[in-house]
Interface confidence: medium
């Protein structure tokens, strides 16, 4: 229903705490360079204005849209052009073009320093002094680095952060209590970020229909006992929620997400038998829990998929009468039978089915033509299954770091033009798939591996879009989202690349590497590995292993030496010579 004052309506629905958190996230995601204090001031002004509108919905400007109110606030920031360049041009536009312009200027890779966690004592002191400000800083720092982070989910992670600090800051050994718990939250939040970015990419590039298809497949896998009408309703609502969040309408998004959670909990009987535990939780935990609830038990008596979609004499008639509905029911029926498939695979199968019907229903004898369609799915299913087996076997053999290195070599050969930091980031993220998915039961591996890889490759595509240096990458990123992962997997050594000459300075290291944390050390070594591959893209695995083992040995020896500097300056050139010879 229409409300006289949209801002008052959202403030009332969400409550002050969530309202302020969401406005802070929105501002931080739009203007990523502003300090926390600048944003906090704007948030307070917006909140005070919202309270005025709650008191009197007819007060001046209370009838304005949220985009108008928020956009006016952002455009009033001093020195906007100096700090944000052409983003300031957005302020010359009217809504809705102004908001679209802000969205286009969101930076997926802002030049901000990594978010460093303070040491435990300092963190606990500032948390105890002012928990609200502390959590505000957390929301601001995450949101500006991840401008498409799912806002209501970020509130959930802030709540987790808060609970961990409350618990650990009361302990004697704060450090050992905080570190593993906060690392766990950070890891989950980073995965949540790339997954949500993928959803927004799907929405931006291919529209609501594409996202809704994704949602139908995902929901059908999770709720196989819900009927098609129920799944369609949930998918439509979920599409609206995600569209709002991806579009920067964070208050509406959080409000509608809460409504969806409420609906699901009120209709458990027609959705799933697994929802009760989630529904007993408070709002943020409830919505989070529902988003990753375990799959319901599949109905025992499901007929073979062929009955309605291959053997039925009316297939072409049903398809012609309502294409989207018929394909939707196919996707629903196939997905609810296959919780062991990735959503990407299910969408590829639906696409194959659609293409088969398009072709066959125009022929003289359609049933003879589409009769083999299910058999034609086989290679599409085998390809990701083989990918999972090969990669999980490799992960089990090499461990996470070794697996990342294998992926780094592979991807540097596929796209040597891509900058080394981007290749290293991508390989490290792709390599985490092993730890994340390969330890799962067999039937959960494929959906975990492929949907995670797709999300990471989406980030590779977004970064590459900014500076499109590789025709290989451009080709894979230009196609449909569900074809990306198979496209990247199929890439081989880029023959158009002209290798760089071996440069000693690229492989010269100093004693400061010895004091770096393990993660930073790994990144340095992986940077060197990528540069080696760029120098010799056709180097064998054996040659690269020899060089990297020698390099690891060199670091180990010099970092243990009494006079580290001398060791690095004398042994370093010898290492370079040996590397050169090994790769000759």
């Amino acid at each position: 229903e229409a409300h006289k004052s949209e801002i008052a309506h959202r403030y009332n629905d969400l409550g002050e705490q969530h309202f302020k958190g969401l406005v802070l996230i929105a501002f931080s995601q739009y203007l990523q360079k502003c300090s926390y204090d600048e944003h906090a001031k704007l948030v307070q002004e917006v909140t005070d204005f919202a309270k005025t509108c709650v008191a009197d919905e007819s007060a001046a400007n209370c009838d304005k849209s949220l985009h108008t109110l928020f956009g006016d606030k952002l455009c009033a920031i001093p020195n906007l052009r100096e700090n944000y360049g052409e983003l300031a041009d957005c302020c010359t536009k009217q809504e809705p073009e102004r908001n679209e312009c802000f969205l286009q200027h969101k930076d997926d890779n802002p030049s901000l320093p990594p978010f460093e966690r303070p040491e435990a004592e300092a963190m606990c002191t500032s948390f105890k002094e002012n928990p609200t400000t502390f959590m505000g800083h957390y929301l601001h720092e995450v949101a500006r680095r991840h401008p498409y982070f799912y806002a209501p989910e970020l509130l959930y992670y802030a709540e987790q952060y808060n609970e961990i600090l409350t618990q650990c800051c009361a302990e004697a050994d704060k450090e050992s209590c905080l570190t593993p718990k906060l690392d766990g939250v950070k890891e989950k939040a980073l995965v949540s970020s790339v997954r949500q970015r993928m959803k927004c990419s799907s929405m931006q590039k291919f529209g609501e229909r594409a996202f809704k298809a994704w949602a139908v497949a995902r929901l059908s896998q999770t709720f196989p006992n819900a009927d098609f009408a129920e799944i369609t309703k949930l998918a439509t609502d979920l599409t609206k929620v995600n569209k709002e969040c991806c579009h920067g309408d964070l208050l509406e998004c959080a409000d509608d997400r809460a409504e969806l959670a409420k609906y699901m909990c009120e209709n458990q009987a027609t959705i799933s038998s697994k929802l009760q535990t989630c529904c007993d939780k408070p709002l943020l935990k409830k919505a989070h829990c529902l988003s990753e609830v375990e799959h319901d038990t599949m109905p025992a008596d499901l007929p073979a998929i062929a009955a309605d979609f291959v053997e039925d004499q009316e297939v072409c008639k049903n398809y012609a009468e309502a294409k989207d509905v018929f394909l939707g029911t196919f996707l629903y029926e196939y997905s609810r039978r296959h919780p062991d498939y990735s959503v990407s695979l299910l969408l590829r199968l639906a696409k194959k089915y659609e293409a088969t019907l398009e072709k066959c229903c125009a022929e003289a004898n359609p049933p003879a033509c589409y009769g083999t369609v299910l058999a034609e799915f086989q290679p599409l299913v085998e390809e990701p299954k083989n990918l999972v087996k090969t990669n999980c076997d490799l992960y089990e053999k090499l461990g996470e770091y070794g697996f990342q290195n294998a992926i780094l070599v592979r991807y540097t050969q596929k796209a040597p033009q891509v900058s080394t930091p981007t290749l290293v980031e991508a390989a490290r993220n792709l390599g985490r798939v092993g730890t994340k998915c390969c330890t799962l039961p067999e039937d959960q591996r494929l959906p975990c591996v492929e949907d995670y890889l797709s999300a990471i490759l989406n980030r590779v595509c977004l970064l590459h879009e900014k500076t499109p240096v590789s025709e290989h990458v451009t080709k894979c990123c230009s196609g449909s989202l569900v074809e990306r992962r198979p496209c990247f997997s199929a890439l081989t050594v880029d023959e158009t690349y002209v290798p760089k000459e071996f440069k000693a300075e690229t492989f010269t290291f100093h004693s400061d590497i010895c004091t770096l944390p393990e993660k930073e050390k790994q990144i340095k070594k992986q940077t060197a590995l990528a540069e080696l591959v760029k120098h010799k893209p056709k180097a064998t695995a054996e040659q690269l292993k020899t060089v990297m083992d020698d390099f690891a040995q060199f670091l180990d020896t010099c970092c243990k030496a009494a006079d580290k500097d001398t060791c690095f300056s004398t042994e370093g050139p010898n290492l370079v010579t040996r590397c050169k010879d090994a790769l000759a």
Epitope: P416, Q417, S419, K466, P468, V469, S470, T496, Y497
Partner: nanobody
Framework: QVQLQESGGGLVQPGNSLRLSCAAS????????MSWVRQAPGKEPEWVSE????????IYADSVKDRFTISRDNAKSTLYLQMNSLKPEDTAVYYC????????SSQGTQVTVSS
């Protein structure tokens, strides 16, 4: 549509100089590191030199070091290669590239060093 148009090649005697230019369009030139690559008849392509986005960092193949200078003008979206003390073995087609790939669309410019 990314386009790279090389020019400035020609026939010169050993010891002389040439200045190659590469006009870039269809992308934000200042965001990319650029390089020169050359291919002599019947030989594999050879990397010559590379320059960072800002122009601050440059590296050269040993075979051209101290004779060739790479530079760029971001305002004009143009890459340059100043070639001094040319030798017969510098004879090749010279290509400017983004990221080090020989683009199918790039024509290159012929440099012939001969007495």
């Amino acid at each position: 549509q990314v386009q790279l148009q090389e020019s400035g090649g020609g026939l010169v005697q050993p010891g002389n100089s040439l200045r190659l230019s590469c006009a870039a369009s269809g992308f934000t030139f200042r965001n990319f590191g650029m390089s020169w690559v050359r291919q002599a008849p019947g030989k594999e392509p050879e990397w010559v030199s590379e320059i960072s986005q800002s122009g601050e960092n440059t590296i050269y193949a040993d075979s051209v070091k101290d004779r060739f200078t790479i530079s760029r003008d971001n305002a004009k979206s143009t890459l340059y290669l100043q070639m001094n003390s040319l030798k017969p073995e510098d004879t090749a087609v010279y290509y400017c590239t983004i990221g080090g790939s020989l683009s199918r669309s790039s024509q290159g410019t012929q440099v012939t060093v001969s007495s």
